[in-house]
């Protein structure tokens, strides 16, 4: 598991990974199945209306390890986790949303409190 | 040096079923797909599919899906693809190939010759 | 799925002489991580294919640098500066962005 404070640079993968894509399947994905040389994520967020929605999909290396970090975006309520050790590992990932009122969110620094997984097996 | 071994010449009867093997040597077996792929006289290369050997997954040609099945033996380092119900059309060099992103390393191919 | 046109399909050349060989994709290489998965091979008589370029312009190990590879998008060639006679065979491009994978038809080349 990978803690908030770690900046450990991701690092390229000998292999193309395959990841289920919902609401989130590029142009090159096939079967709500996309590749990549990054991530497999899954991701939770609430919609305008406040309504959770759950997407899926693959993220690319370049970028991918601080959109994997999950750091907390004022007034917006939104959970990713991501991962890596096997092909279409992100079916198996669960984000929750955030409390609603969270002073650890608003206030103080950045602790330990995310539900994410960011593996790093290569 | 990464290689990848496949046996000499098959020869089969129609209706028969075989499978085709492709040890690799040279590297982490674990660390790159195996791709297979089917190559006729005068009629190119034809991409039949891959398996990952760190989880078993695969990914099929939609041509020749029921055709082939892909399997691997991560303890000895081998890749196997079946083909069954052949027929003259099967009649074919099959190669196995290291894939990253791209096939890097090919095996020398097996010819199968199916006739009664 | 992806078609992959190569021409020449035959390509006399006398040794020394530059050689060029064009491969089209029916649709864009381009793959969302931004890589473009297009890929060249030289295939001689009785043998396996070889890599030779990879990712449109990569000389893989061991190539040498007569060989080159350039292009984006859809249109992609391979270019051999001064032939020799060791690189007769059959060359193809390959993609693999879009499953299935696919080649091109194969271009020959031999001598004039």
């Known amino acids: 598991k990978k803690e908030d404070g770690e900046s450990t640079a991701p690092t390229a993968r000998p292999k193309v990974l395959r990841c289920k894509c919902h609401h989130h399947c590029p142009e090159d994905s096939v079967n709500n199945i996309c590749s990549t040389d990054g991530y497999c994520f899954t991701m939770i967020e609430e919609d305008d209306s406040g309504t959770p929605v759950v997407t899926s999909g693959c993220l690319g290396l370049e970028g991918s390890d601080f959109q994997c970090r999950d750091t907390p975006i004022p007034h917006q309520r939104r959970s990713i986790e991501c991962c890596t050790e096997r092909n279409e590992c992100n079916k198996d990932l669960h984000p929750t949303l955030p409390p609603l009122k969270d002073r650890d969110f608003v206030d103080g620094p950045i602790h330990h409190k995310h539900h994410h997984h960011h593996h790093h097996h290569h | 040096q990464v290689q990848l071994q496949q046996p000499g010449p098959e020869f089969v009867k129609p209706g028969a079923s075989v499978k085709l093997s492709c040890k690799a040597s040279g590297y982490t077996f674990t660390s790159y797909w195996v791709q297979w792929v089917k190559q006729r006289p005068g009629q190119g290369l034809e991409w039949i599919g891959e398996i990952d050997p760190s989880d078993n997954y695969t990914l099929y040609n939609q041509n020749f899906k029921g055709k082939a099945t892909l399997t691997v033996d991560t303890s000895s380092s081998t890749a196997y693809m079946q083909l069954s119900s052949l027929t003259s059309e099967d009649s074919a060099v099959y190669y196995c190939?290291?894939?990253?992103?791209?096939?890097?390393?090919w095996g020398q191919g097996t010819t199968l010759t199916v006739s009664s | 799925d992806v078609v992959m046109t190569q021409t020449p399909l035959s390509l006399p050349v006398s040794l020394g002489e530059q050689a060029s060989i064009s491969c089209r994709s029916s649709?864009?290489?381009?793959?969302?991580?931004?890589?473009?998965?297009l890929h060249w091979y030289l295939q001689k008589p009785g043998q396996s294919p070889k890599l030779l370029i990879y990712?449109?312009?990569n000389r893989f190990s061991g190539v040498p640098d007569r060989f080159s590879g350039s292009g984006s998008g859809t249109d992609f060639t391979l270019k051999i500066s001064r032939v020799e006679a060791e690189d007769l065979g059959v060359y193809f491009c390959s993609q693999s962005t879009h499953v299935p994978f696919t080649f091109g038809s194969g271009t020959k080349l031999e001598i004039k």
């Open positions: 190939a290291r894939f990253g992103f791209y096939v890097d390393y």
């Open positions: 649709q864009s290489l381009v793959h969302s991580t931004g890589n473009t998965y």
């Open positions: 990712k449109v312009s």
